[in-house]
């Protein structure tokens, strides 16, 4: 706590300007009116205050707005935003995308901090859903943002927002997240023609079911191995050798290099060796000729 001391004669701040950087901690506390600070917050960012001085300025705003800062102040916080705790931010009601952008700009180049995560959470909850403009903004600042959301949170993303998603935005998504995003992407891109559709949907295919992969195999898409390796194992297993060959096109040769890794390894174990041999890649581990394959999962379902 800063002691309450009287402001020395002639030192009372008439405006927020660079002369204040020469004020000692107690002088700032005594000589800067909190209401003046609030109305001239836009100037603070242009003045090279020390961290100690920023602590004093924050303390003044906290006293003026114990229930949380108004958006007019929040929008101009600048570097002072880095001083806020998640608890401070939970008191805010941020509705303007411009305010969000201004604060994200301050944190640009740094990893997503707890403060930023709280700010985004408050903003998205206030809007009710993750609309396209918001998603555009967030992924521009944090390409991994989408993959930081839980499947439940992702369920509030409207299909129209999927157009804002770039392939790199999905790099760190796990299968559970892609399971939620894929149907939205399928809906968003449904009116595109074959090749264009595949280009757009490709990054989301880690959430695709078997029937969609079968359908893609009929469209000469030439899926690359990197995409194939990210597919759900349970979606790949029922595909026939012929379907995988059609799905991968010229990239089918890459299966050999990946034969020990999922989902290729598990898929090989489900195929007849005869069928695998037709690929001419030397893939081993298939079901030997003459063996009968029982689908136990089907039997369990019947019993």
């Amino acid at each position: 706590e800063v002691e309450k001391t009287a402001c020395p004669s002639g030192k009372k701040a008439r405006e927020i300007d660079e002369s204040l950087i020469f004020y000692k901690k107690w002088e700032l506390e005594a000589c800067v009116d909190a209401a003046l600070l609030a109305t001239q917050m836009d100037r603070v960012n242009a003045i090279p205050f020390t961290y100690e001085q920023l602590d004093v300025l924050k303390h003044k705003l906290d006293e003026l707005y114990p229930q949380g800062y108004p958006e007019s102040v929040i929008q101009h916080l600048g570097y002072l935003f880095l001083k806020m705790s998640p608890e401070d931010i939970r008191k805010w009601n941020v509705t303007s995308l411009e305010t969000l952008k201004a604060l994200l700009e301050v944190n640009k180049g740094h990893e997503m901090s707890p403060q930023v995560a709280t700010l985004i959470d408050r903003f998205v909850k206030g809007r009710g859903q993750l609309d396209k403009d918001t998603l555009d903004t967030l992924t521009a600042f944090y390409p991994g943002y989408l993959c930081s959301l839980s499947p439940e949170e992702l369920s509030s993303v409207p299909p129209s927002s999927i157009w804002a998603v770039r392939p790199q935005d999905l790099d760190t998504c796990d299968p559970r997240q892609l399971d939620v995003l894929y149907p939205k992407a399928r809906l968003a891109f449904q009116n595109m023609n074959g090749s264009e559709y595949f280009v757009k949907i490709q990054s989301f295919l880690g959430g695709a079911p078997t029937e969609d992969l079968k359908a893609l195999s009929q469209q000469n898409v030439s899926m690359d191995l990197a995409t194939f390796m990210k597919l759900r194992t349970d979606a790949v297993l029922p595909l026939t050798v012929a379907e995988v060959q059609k799905l991968l096109g010229p990239h089918v040769e890459g299966l050999k290099a990946e034969e020990r890794h999922r989902p290729v390894r598990d898929w090989i174990l489900r195929q007849r060796q005869d069928d695998l041999d037709t690929l001419g890649l030397g893939l081993q581990g298939g079901i030997p000729n003459g063996y009968l394959v029982l689908d136990l999962s089907m039997q369990e379902a019947l019993s």
Epitope: I21, K25, N45, P48, T50, Y51, E52, Y79
Partner: antibody, heavy 119, light 108 residues
């Protein structure tokens, strides 16, 4: 690429004013504050002062009156107003690590320029 | 008057070993402390800022910790190239903008 380079260091007699110049490239002095740090032979680092993007100067308490920092669009000068033998040191120019701050860490340093004060 | 005190100096350890350098501030500076490495004839090189954040391109063998008045720099898996003098610097307030006295690290 971004760089800073000091020049002007030489042998001077006590009381003869000397101005050192720091020339920057690859970034703008309107975006970053710049500081001067010195190091006497075999001794540690000593912060002298810093100049803000807006041209405001701030000095270590021991350096007030002994040094003057000023700048142009691409250079930052350090004037040693009346050198004494205690001012013999390598003088480094360094960029403050983030725009918007006057007091911060330094993330870009010059190689330094040697000033020798002797009669 | 604000002071940053570094201990010990010099400190020595064998290749592959670990050294810990301490920096003590005479006032609370929160986490606003940086660490630098300086080799003879070269300018200082930023290693760590805000007490624990590794600067770009710096090996993860360097680890900073602490807040308030007590800070440490730990160098693990020592290499010959780590032989240098290490400085801490505070930048919380105008009155506490200063460097520590330096700690020489000798690698045997």
């Amino acid at each position: 690429s971004q760089s800073v380079e000091e020049s002007g260091g030489r042998l001077v007699t006590p009381g003869t004013p000397l101005t050192l110049t720091c020339t920057v490239s690859g970034f703008s002095l309107s975006s970053y504050a710049m500081g001067w740090v010195r190091q006497a032979p075999g001794e540690g680092l000593e912060w002298i002062g810093t100049i803000s993007t807006g041209g405001i100067t701030y000095y270590a308490s021991w350096a007030k009156g002994r040094f003057t920092i000023s700048k142009t669009s691409t250079t930052v000068d350090l004037k040693i107003t009346s050198p004494t033998t205690e001012d013999t040191a390598t003088y480094f120019c360094a960029r403050v690590g983030s725009s918007g701050y006057l007091f911060y860490f330094f993330n870009l340093w010059g190689q330094g320029t040697l000033v020798t004060v002797s009669s | 008057v604000f002071e940053l005190t570094q201990t010990p100096s010099p400190v020595s350890a064998a290749v592959g070993g670990t050294v810990t350098i301490r920096c003590q501030a005479s006032q609370n500076i929160k986490s606003y402390l940086a660490w630098y490495q300086q080799k003879p004839g070269q300018p200082p090189k930023l290693l760590i800022y805000e007490a624990s954040i590794l600067a770009s391109g710096v090996s993860s063998r360097f680890k900073g910790s602490g807040s308030g008045t007590e800070f440490t720099l730990t160098i693990s898996d020592l290499e010959c190239a780590d032989a240098a003098t290490y400085y801490c610097q505070s930048y919380y307030a105008a009155s506490s903008n200063a460097f520590g006295g330096g700690t020489e690290v000798v690698v045997k």
